[in-house]
Interface confidence: medium
C-alpha cells in the first residue's frame, strides 16, 4: 500500500487565497464599473450623488503604504457588508425604473456575498480577530420617489466602485507582506 493519506485539507495556502480574493475583487470592480455605466446611459447623473448611510471611503491611495493586514481586512469587510446591504435594499425598494438593471444587480449581489465569505475565511486562516456579527442595522428608508431610487443607485455603485478600487490596491500591497 502507498503512504498513509495526509490530513484532511481545507483549501489553499492563505497567499493563494489572497490571490483569488484579488481576482474576485477585480472582477467585481469590472462588474460595478459596467453597471454604473449602464445606469448612466439610462439615467444620466446630474452631478455627484451621496447617500448618508453609505460608509466613507476607507483610505486614500497615498496612505496605502501604512496599512496593516488586520485593519485593512476588518475595514474592507465592514464596508462591503454595508454595500451588500445597500444593494439588497436597492433591488427590493428601488422601484420599477431600476428593474432594467436586472439580472446584473443580482449577479453583483451574489459576487459581493462571495467576496465577503472569502475575506472572512482569509481573516480566520491568519488568526486575525473576527468582529462579532453586527446587530441588525435599522432598515433603510425607501426612496422618496423614483428619481430618489435612481440617485441612490448612482451613489451606491459609485461608492462601491471607489471602495473596490481601493481594495484591489490594498490587497495587492498586503500580498507582498504575507
Amino acid at each position: 500500500p502507498g503512504p498513509p493519506p495526509g490530513p484532511p485539507r481545507v483549501s489553499p495556502d492563505p497567499r493563494a487565497e489572497l490571490d483569488s480574493t484579488v481576482l474576485l475583487t477585480r472582477s467585481l470592480l469590472a462588474d460595478t464599473r459596467q453597471l454604473a455605466a449602464q445606469l448612466r446611459d439610462k439615467f444620466p447623473a446630474d452631478g455627484d450623488h451621496n447617500l448618508d448611510s453609505l460608509p466613507t471611503l476607507a483610505m486614500s491611495a497615498g496612505a496605502l503604504g501604512a496599512l496593516q493586514l488586520p485593519g485593512v481586512l476588518t475595514r474592507l469587510r465592514a464596508d462591503l457588508l454595508s454595500y451588500l446591504r445597500h444593494v439588497q435594499w436597492l433591488r427590493r425598494a428601488g422601484g420599477s425604473s431600476l428593474k432594467t438593471l436586472e439580472p446584473e444587480l443580482g449577479t453583483l449581489q451574489a459576487r459581493l456575498d462571495r467576496l465577503l465569505r472569502r475575506l472572512q475565511l482569509l481573516m480566520s486562516r491568519l488568526a486575525l480577530p473576527q468582529p462579532p456579527p453586527d446587530p441588525p442595522a435599522p432598515p433603510l428608508a425607501p426612496p422618496s420617489s423614483a428619481w430618489g431610487g435612481i440617485r441612490a443607485a448612482h451613489a451606491i455603485l459609485g461608492g462601491l466602485h471607489l471602495t473596490l478600487d481601493w481594495a484591489v490596491r490594498g490587497l495587492l500591497l498586503l500580498k507582498t507582506r504575507l
Epitope: V10, S11, P70, L121, S124, R125, A127, P132
Partner: antibody
C-alpha cells in the same frame, strides 16, 4: 508532506517551567495562524492558545492566562509554548495545530506529553 | 469559557444514521457560523471532519454532515460503519476570539 512535530515535553515539578516547540514543514508556516490544544489523560480536548500568522494577535484560555505564552519564529518555521508556574492539572498531551478556518484545525502534530508531579 | 455540552456516548448499528448534538451559548455557537467537528481514535491526534458548521474537508467521507440552529450544532453520520467508532468533539469560535471544545462523545458501533 505537510507536518507538525512537537517536542519539549517531559516531567516537571509543580511551579516549574517548560518550553514546548512545534516544528512545521511542507507548507508556508508564516501564512497560517496556529493553535495549541491539550488533552489530559482520559479526558477531552481543551483549547490552550492561538497566535496569528505574524504573531501580532495572541489569545489564551482562562485556565492558562498569565502563566503560558504562545510565540512563533517564522524564520525557523517553529511555534512555541512557554509554560511557567506549572500545576498538576496542566498534565496532558499537548498538540500544535494549523488553522484551517476560524476554529477548524486541519493539520495536527502527534503530541508531546507534559507531566507535572512532585 | 465553559465547555460546549455533548452527550457522553451514543451508539448505533452498522448502516444506521446517528446524530451527535453540541449545545453552546449566544457567545459561541450562536454568534458565528464557526463550528467544527473532530474525530479521535485512541492514541491518535484528532482529525478535522467538519468546519464552518457544514463544510467537509477534502478526503472526509460525505457520510459526515454538520448543521446548526441557534445555539446548538449537530453532526450526523449516515450509514455508520465500524471504523467510525471513535470519540467526537465539537468546537466553536467565540466572541472573545478564543476557541471552546465540547466534552466529547464516544460513538460505539454495535
Amino acid at each position: 508532506e505537510v507536518q507538525l512535530v512537537e517536542s519539549g515535553g517531559g516531567l516537571v515539578q509543580p511551579g516549574g517551567s517548560l518550553r514546548l516547540s512545534c516544528a512545521a514543514s511542507g507548507f508556508t508556516f508564516s501564512s497560517y495562524g496556529m493553535h495549541w490544544v491539550r488533552q489530559a489523560p482520559g479526558k477531552g480536548l481543551e483549547w490552550v492558545a492561538v497566535i496569528s500568522y505574524d504573531g501580532s494577535n495572541k489569545y489564551y484560555a482562562d485556565s492558562v492566562k498569565g502563566r503560558f505564552t504562545i510565540s512563533r519564529d517564522n524564520s525557523k518555521n517553529t511555534l512555541y509554548l512557554q509554560m511557567n508556574s506549572l500545576r498538576a492539572e496542566d498534565t496532558a498531551v499537548y498538540y500544535c495545530a494549523r488553522i484551517a478556518a476560524a476554529d477548524g484545525m486541519d493539520v495536527w502534530g502527534q503530541g508531546t506529553t507534559v507531566t507535572v508531579s512532585s | 469559557q465553559s465547555a460546549l455540552t455533548q452527550p457522553a456516548s451514543v451508539s448505533g448499528s452498522p448502516g444506521q444514521s446517528i446524530t451527535i448534538s453540541c449545545t453552546g451559548t449566544s457567545s459561541d455557537i450562536g454568534a458565528y457560523n464557526y463550528v467544527s467537528w473532530y474525530q479521535q481514535h485512541p492514541g491518535k491526534a484528532p482529525k478535522l471532519m467538519i468546519y464552518d458548521v457544514s463544510h467537509r474537508p477534502s478526503g472526509v467521507s460525505n457520510r459526515f454532515s454538520g448543521s446548526k440552529s441557534g445555539n446548538a450544532a449537530s453532526l450526523t453520520i449516515s450509514g455508520v460503519q465500524a471504523e467510525d467508532g471513535a470519540d467526537y468533539y465539537c468546537s466553536s469560535y467565540t466572541t472573545s476570539s478564543t476557541v471552546v471544545f465540547g466534552g466529547g462523545t464516544q460513538l460505539t458501533v454495535l
